[in-house]
C-alpha cells in the first residue's frame, strides 16, 4: 500500500482542516488508514482523524481543530496499521479556504433595485470576519451567455444592482463565494444558489 498523491490540506480558519490524498489503488480509507495530527507546541497530544473515501483510491479527512492562529503548525502522520506511509506538516494560516457564505437572499421589493444579502460565515471574534470580500455570480436559467460576476470589495455582505441591468420576465439564479486577501486564501466554495423571477417596469417612453 502506497500513497500516490501526498496529502494536501486546507483550513477554514475556524475549526476544521480538510486533507485529501490518493492511494495507489482502491482503498477502504476508514478501515485501513489513520491520519494523526499534532500541534507543534509544548505538551500537545496527537489526535486521530478517520478518513473517508473520496472516489476509488481517494481519501479525505476532516481534522477538528481549535480556533486557528498564525503561529499554529501541525505534524501529520499517515498510518496503515503499524506502517507509516507518509509524514508531513501543515500550517493552517498558509493554506486557508474560507467557509462558503450562507443565507443568500434576493430582495425584489425595493423599487426597481435588486438587493442581495448573505451571511458572513464567520463569528465576529474570528480574524476573517472583517477580512472577507465576495464575488456574486448571477446567471440566467434560459440563456447560458447571460452570466455575470460582481466583485464585492467592501465588508458589508450585500449587493445592490438595478433590476434593469438584467432582462425582465426571466428567472435568474445567484450564488456567492468569499476570499480573504490578508491570508492570500483560495476562494470558498459557492453558496447554495437562490432563484428569483426578474420583473420591473419599463420606463415610459415619450414620443
Amino acid at each position: 500500500m502506497k500513497v500516490l498523491q501526498e496529502p494536501t490540506c486546507v483550513s477554514d480558519y475556524m475549526s476544521i482542516s480538510t486533507c485529501e490524498w490518493k492511494m495507489n489503488g482502491p482503498t477502504n480509507c476508514s478501515t485501513e488508514l489513520r491520519l494523526l495530527y499534532q500541534l507543534v507546541f509544548l505538551l500537545s497530544e496527537a489526535h486521530t482523524c478517520i478518513p473517508e473515501n473520496n472516489g476509488g483510491a481517494g481519501c479525505v479527512c476532516h481534522l477538528l481543530m481549535d480556533d486557528v492562529v498564525s503561529a499554529d503548525n501541525y505534524t501529520l502522520d499517515l498510518w496503515a496499521g503499524q506502517q507509516l506511509l507518509w509524514k508531513g506538516s501543515f500550517k493552517p494560516s498558509e493554506h486557508v479556504k474560507p467557509r462558503a457564505p450562507g443565507n443568500l437572499t434576493v430582495h425584489t421589493n425595493v423599487s426597481d433595485t435588486l438587493l442581495l444579502t448573505w451571511s458572513n460565515p464567520y463569528p465576529p471574534d474570528n480574524y476573517l470576519y472583517n477580512h472577507l470580500t465576495y464575488a456574486v455570480n448571477i446567471w440566467s436559467e434560459n440563456d447560458p451567455a447571460d452570466f455575470r460576476i460582481y466583485n464585492v470589495t467592501y465588508l458589508e455582505p450585500s449587493l445592490r444592482i438595478a433590476a434593469s441591468t438584467l432582462k425582465s420576465g426571466i428567472s435568474y439564479r445567484a450564488r456567492v463565494r468569499a476570499w480573504a486577501q490578508c491570508y492570500n486564501t483560495t476562494w470558498s466554495e459557492w453558496s447554495p444558489s437562490t432563484k428569483w423571477h426578474n420583473s420591473y417596469r419599463e420606463p415610459f417612453e415619450q414620443h
Epitope: L39, F41, L42, L43, S44, E45, A46, H47, L64, M65, D66, V69, S70, A71, D72
Partner: antibody, heavy 125, light 112 residues
Framework: EVQLVESGGGLEQPGGSLRLSCAGS????????MTWVRQAPGKGLEWVSS????????YYADSVKGRFTISRDNSKNTLYLQMNSLRAEDTAVYYC??????????????????WGQGTTVTVSS | DIVMTQSPLSLPVTPGEPASISCRSS???????????VDWYLQKSGQSPQLLIY???KRASGVPDRFSGSGSGTDFTLKISRVEAEDVGFYYC?????????FGQGTKLEIK
C-alpha cells in the same frame, strides 16, 4: 477539592535511586499535563520535568536528562519521577504541579495552578 | 534556553504602598495575541508556591485583585496596588512557552 500529594522522598546515597509519586484528586487527571519542580535548600525554583496528559510527550531539564524519568498511570491518577544516579546537587524539595489541559488540540494553559506540599529528597553519603 | 531576569531581587515596601516587580525574557514568549506564556508565583515562608498570574495578565482563581500582571513579548510586570503584610515572600516569574520552563531568580518582598 483539587489536590496533589507527593510521597517517596528520603535520604539516599550518591548513585542511588528513588521514586517519587504524586497522587492527584478532584480533577480529571488524564486530561492535564503534569510537572515536577524542585527547590534546593535556600535556593529558587527549578523546573525538572513535564509530561502530557496521555504520557506521550515528556520533557526534561538538562541537569536531570538521562537520569530521571517522568511517567504517569492515569488509571491510578498518579504521577511518578524515577530518579537514578542521584547526585548531591539533586538534594531539594520536589513539588508536583498540575499543568495545562493537554487533551485539547491546542493545549489550554492556566498556569501551574495546583501544587503539592512537596517531598524532601536528600542525597548524601 | 530562554533566560528570565527579575528585578529587583529585594523589595522592601511599606504596607498600603504599591509594589512593582519586573521580569524580562531573553526571547519572546508570545505565541499569539493574548497568549504570553509567563506566570507569576508567590512562595510564602515554609509553603508551596502559589499561582498569582498566568498568560501574562490573567489573575488566577482566588487571587486578590490588588495583584495584576502586564506586558507582552519579552517585558513583564507584576504590580501590587496596595501591599499587605500577608504579601511577604518570594515572587517568581516563569516562562512556560517552551522547554525548559525557566523561573526568574526570585524577588524577596518584605515589609519595611
Amino acid at each position: 477539592e483539587v489536590q496533589l500529594v507527593e510521597s517517596g522522598g528520603g535520604l539516599e546515597q550518591p548513585g542511588g535511586s528513588l521514586r517519587l509519586s504524586c497522587a492527584g484528586s478532584g480533577f480529571t487527571f488524564r486530561d492535564f499535563a503534569m510537572t515536577w519542580v524542585r527547590q534546593a535548600p535556600g535556593k529558587g525554583l527549578e523546573w525538572v520535568s513535564s509530561v502530557s496528559g496521555d504520557g506521550g510527550n515528556t520533557y526534561y531539564a538538562d541537569s536531570v536528562k538521562g537520569r530521571f524519568t517522568i511517567s504517569r498511570d492515569n488509571s491510578k491518577n498518579t504521577l511518578y519521577l524515577q530518579m537514578n544516579s542521584l547526585r548531591a546537587e539533586d538534594t531539594a524539595v520536589y513539588y508536583c504541579a498540575k499543568d495545562r489541559l493537554s487533551k485539547t488540540i491546542r493545549p489550554r494553559y492556566y498556569g501551574l495552578d495546583v501544587w503539592g506540599q512537596g517531598t524532601t529528597v536528600t542525597v548524601s553519603s | 534556553d530562554i533566560v528570565m531576569t527579575q528585578s529587583p531581587l529585594s523589595l522592601p515596601v511599606t504596607p498600603g504602598e504599591p509594589a512593582s516587580i519586573s521580569c524580562r525574557s531573553s526571547q519572546s514568549v508570545l505565541y499569539s495575541i493574548g497568549y504570553n506564556y509567563v506566570d507569576w508565583y508567590l512562595q510564602k515562608s515554609g509553603q508551596s508556591p502559589q499561582l498569582l498570574i498566568y498568560l501574562g495578565n490573567k489573575r488566577a482563581s482566588g487571587v486578590p485583585d490588588r495583584f495584576s500582571g502586564s506586558g507582552s513579548g519579552t517585558d513583564f510586570t507584576l504590580k501590587i496596588s496596595r501591599v499587605e503584610a500577608e504579601d511577604v515572600g518570594f515572587y517568581y516569574c516563569m516562562q512556560a512557552y517552551q522547554s525548559p520552563y525557566v523561573f526568574g531568580q526570585g524577588t524577596k518582598l518584605e515589609i519595611k
